[in-house]
């Protein structure tokens, strides 16, 4: 399986997969109120998670889980039945150019957002990279500015695609720079909907 | 909640919400030919609107409204029934680096495309931000060039996600820089499709 | 921004939607294609490997998806471009990257852009670099329509199953 994907910031893919999870813990026995019993679907909203960077809300604002979809911090999003799912993700990022001088390479940052599956036939130790997007940001520096940070920059990395999922498999998001995630409303989310 | 999002160009949030609508007027009693009676769906295509920047076409090229979906300039896109909708938007932007000299920060522009809902339970005066993407563009400047403009730059800001909508609610797009929208075919659109 | 917070009752409001059921057929027309990693200077779509598939009537012919039945389809595609350190030589001009999904139909005598994204990157000023382009939307398609892609910057594609893909499904 293609585990490598885009260049990441951790040497061990397994560790990296786990490191990036950062989900909010929800008791699995308490799925969200079922608005659409015939349609497994979920929309999770990015939220700051103490010490881990990126967590996910399942009830606030527009977030929801329907029809037996379940979500847990440790294992990600579980879909209740075999089927064809449209999976999607958008992560907003923000940051500042560092002070003038210094290593120019250090000013470029490649932001990566990836969707993995694990569990089921894939086993707990072999997460599989499903979909990913990336964006390199090079904040343009004012050469005269030797101290202080540059202006804020923003970018979004998003994608979506069809994946055949089986009951018992779980999907989760992994990102390269949890410290740069933009948690403003509507900016960071991921979800799934069964389409066949 | 963090409502700030990105810095916009108008001081009054309410005014800006309306200003950003810029929809093309269509009589609500004439929805598009219904090719798929069971499926509320819409795909609207960006079009220049005199004096307001960004308008939307509902009939030209690939644009359509089906199954009772309605669109009006003043109120946006109305979906005919309660349900789970996949909403999406892509806005293409283009511009040129300004003449040489000056502060690089002044050249940065943060492009924002946002999807809101209003009406229904949310009331006419309280639009709710649903999904948003952003991109900061800093056209690389030719420092020696004191007149003329640099090469064109292009970017796209897009997103899509699941939202539970109720009959009577309306969704609309708001953007930060209507003067920079790229209206070339396939570049700027928004839409909705009921998935459950 | 115009957005204001959710009203206190918003979470409850969301739970008050009537129950809705979606009748799933066992199969719906659907396709998910990936870029062939063995073809470095072209973008050839593959349907028989690495999570790629054609289902319920979709077929791949001349690098185009053939629409099996008329209806509304969600069509999507993504590419990721990359550049190595110091890849441009004697230029600081930006590199032009673009990706487009096109429709060829009996109704039109030419390829119609459905989804289109462009980007200028300055490879001499940032290296190495990565840039994604993803887009998707709903379209009314007719049986026999052909969906294809056009990409500028093919030598810079990151050809892997997770980064370069093209798909559609009936709604």
């Amino acid at each position: 399986q293609d585990q490598g994907g885009l260049v990441t910031e951790t040497a061990d893919p397994g560790a990296q997969a786990q490191q990036g999870l950062g989900f909010q813990k929800l008791p699995e026995e308490e799925p969200e109120t079922d608005l659409s019993p015939g349609l497994p679907a979920a929309h999770l909203i990015g939220a700051p998670l103490k010490g881990q960077g990126l967590g996910w809300e399942t009830t606030k604002e527009q977030a929801f889980l329907t029809s037996g979809t379940q979500f847990s911090d440790a294992e990600g999003l579980a879909l209740p039945q075999d089927g064809l799912y449209y999976l999607y993700c958008l992560v907003g990022y923000r940051g500042r150019a560092p002070p003038g001088g210094g290593d120019p390479q250090g000013r470029s940052v490649t932001l990566r957002s990836s969707l993995y599956r694990a569990g089921g036939a894939y086993g707990p130790g072999t997460p599989e990279l499903l979909l990913e997007g990336a964006e390199t940001v090079t904040p343009v520096l004012d050469p005269a500015r030797r101290q202080g940070y540059g202006p804020l920059w923003y970018t979004s990395v998003g994608f979506g695609g069809l994946v055949q999922l089986r009951r018992g498999e779980r999907v989760y998001v992994n990102i390269s720079h949890p410290d740069m995630v933009d948690f403003a409303r509507g900016k960071t989310f991921f979800g799934a909907v069964m389409v066949g | 909640q963090d409502q700030g999002g990105l810095v916009t160009e108008t001081a009054d949030p309410g005014a800006q919400a309306q200003q950003g609508l810029g929809f093309q007027k269509l009589p609500e009693e004439e929805p598009e030919t219904d090719l798929s009676p069971g499926l509320p769906a819409a795909h609207l295509i960006g079009a220049p609107l005199k004096g307001q920047g960004l308008g939307w076409e509902t009939t030209k090229e690939q644009a359509f409204l089906t199954s009772g979906t309605q669109f009006s300039d003043a109120e946006g896109l109305a979906l005919p029934q309660d349900g789970l909708y996949y909403l999406y938007c892509l806005v293409g932007y283009r511009g040129r680096a300004p003449p040489g000299g000056g502060d690089p920060q002044g050249r940065s522009v943060t492009l924002r495309s946002s999807l809101y809902r209003a009406g229904g339970a949310y009331g006419p005066g309280t639009p709710e931000l649903l999904l948003e993407g952003a991109e900061t563009v800093t056209p690389v400047l030719d420092p020696a060039r004191r007149q003329g403009y640099g090469p064109l730059w292009y970017t796209s800001v897009g997103f899509g996600g699941l939202v539970q909508l109720r009959r009577g609610e309306r969704v609309y797009v708001n953007i930060s820089h209507p003067d920079m929208v790229d209206f070339a075919r396939g570049k700027t659109f928004f839409g909705a499709v009921m998935v459950g | 921004l115009p957005g204001v917070g959710l009203t206190p009752s918003a979470a409850q409001t969301a739970r008050q939607h009537p129950k809705m059921h979606l009748a799933h057929s066992t199969l719906k027309p659907a396709a998910h294609l990936i870029g062939d990693p063995s073809k470095q200077n072209s973008l050839l779509w593959r349907a028989n490997t690495d999570r790629a598939f054609l289902q319920d009537g979709f077929s791949l012919s001349n690098n185009s998806l053939l629409v099996p039945t008329s209806g509304i389809y969600f069509v999507y595609s993504q590419v990721v471009f990359s550049g190595k350190a110091y890849s441009p030589k004697a230029t600081s001009s930006p590199l032009y990257l673009a990706h487009e999904v096109q429709l060829f139909s009996s109704q039109y005598p030419f390829h119609v852009p459905l989804l289109s994204s462009q980007k200028m990157v300055y490879p001499g000023l940032q290296e190495p670099w990565l840039h994604s382009m993803y887009h998707g939307a709903a379209f009314q398609l007719t049986q026999g329509d052909q969906l294809s892609t056009h990409t500028d910057g093919i030598p810079h594609l990151v050809l892997s199953p997770s980064t370069v893909f093209f798909g559609a499904f009936a709604l």
């Epitope: 120019p104 | 040489g100 090469p151 | 890849s87 032009y96 200028m120 810079h156």
Partner: antibody, heavy 114, light 113 residues
């Protein structure tokens, strides 16, 4: 093998115009800028401007603005330079180049004379 | 426009000699964001197109012999041929690609002594 091949040069009357072609092969044409550079007999190199074939974006040397026009046909992998109101001092070898990869064409000679 | 000034305009040298050509720009060609100098060196033989030798002021193009080297930063740059070979007799140009319009030096002709 990468090649840029110019054509269209020859003898032109003063006040006339020319259209030079630059046919590219062996690499992906549309993403990379094509530059036009000229060299008068016995003189140095002078940059006329550049075009991005994919986007159609153009940059002109102010000296040639209004007289030079760049265009490209991606289906033919060919870039074009149209020069109007030609004068004797426009006599030169005209080169097209791809600075991204460092490729140059062999040049085509334009002679402006009555 | 950025002015590029080469010196000398011509020189005579023998096979095996070490040859140095300098190029000065009217403003810095160092881009602060990536610390690269936007300068190239070309070799041109009579009746032929220019051939890229050096880019980013010091990076040799593929296939260019190691006797050619580029150095310098900001406004002062040097092309050095460590041991002149018979095929090196030609005219050499520096070019800046830091800003528009791109500009070339007037050329340095290397002749056989």
């Amino acid at each position: 093998e990468v090649q840029l091949v110019e054509s269209g040069g020859g003898l032109v009357q003063p006040g006339g115009s020319l259209r030079l072609s630059c046919a590219a092969s062996g690499y992906t044409f549309s993403s990379y800028w094509i530059e036009w550079v000229r060299q008068a007999p016995g003189k140095g190199l002078e940059w006329v401007g550049e075009i991005n074939p994919g986007s159609g974006s153009t940059i002109y040397n102010e000296k040639f603005k209004g007289r030079a026009t760049f265009s490209a046909d991606n289906s033919k992998n060919t870039a074009y330079l149209q020069m109007n109101s030609l004068r004797a001092e426009d006599t030169a070898v005209y080169y097209c180049a791809d600075g991204y990869h460092g490729y140059w064409g062999q040049g085509t000679l334009v002679t402006v004379s009555s | 426009d950025i002015q590029m000034t080469q010196s000398p305009s011509s020189l005579s040298a023998s096979v095996g000699d070490r040859v140095t050509i300098t190029c000065k720009s009217s403003q810095s060609l160092l881009y602060s964001t990536n610390q690269k100098n936007f300068l190239a060196w070309y070799q041109q033989k009579p009746g032929k197109a220019p051939k890229l030798l050096i880019y980013w002021a010091s990076t040799r193009d593929s296939g260019v012999p190691s006797r050619f080297s580029g150095s310098g930063s900001g406004t002062d740059f040097t092309l050095t041929i460590s041991s002149l070979q018979p095929e090196d007799f030609a005219t050499y140009y520096c070019q800046q690609y830091y800003s528009y319009p791109r500009t070339f030096g007037q050329g340095t002709k290397v002749e056989i002594k």
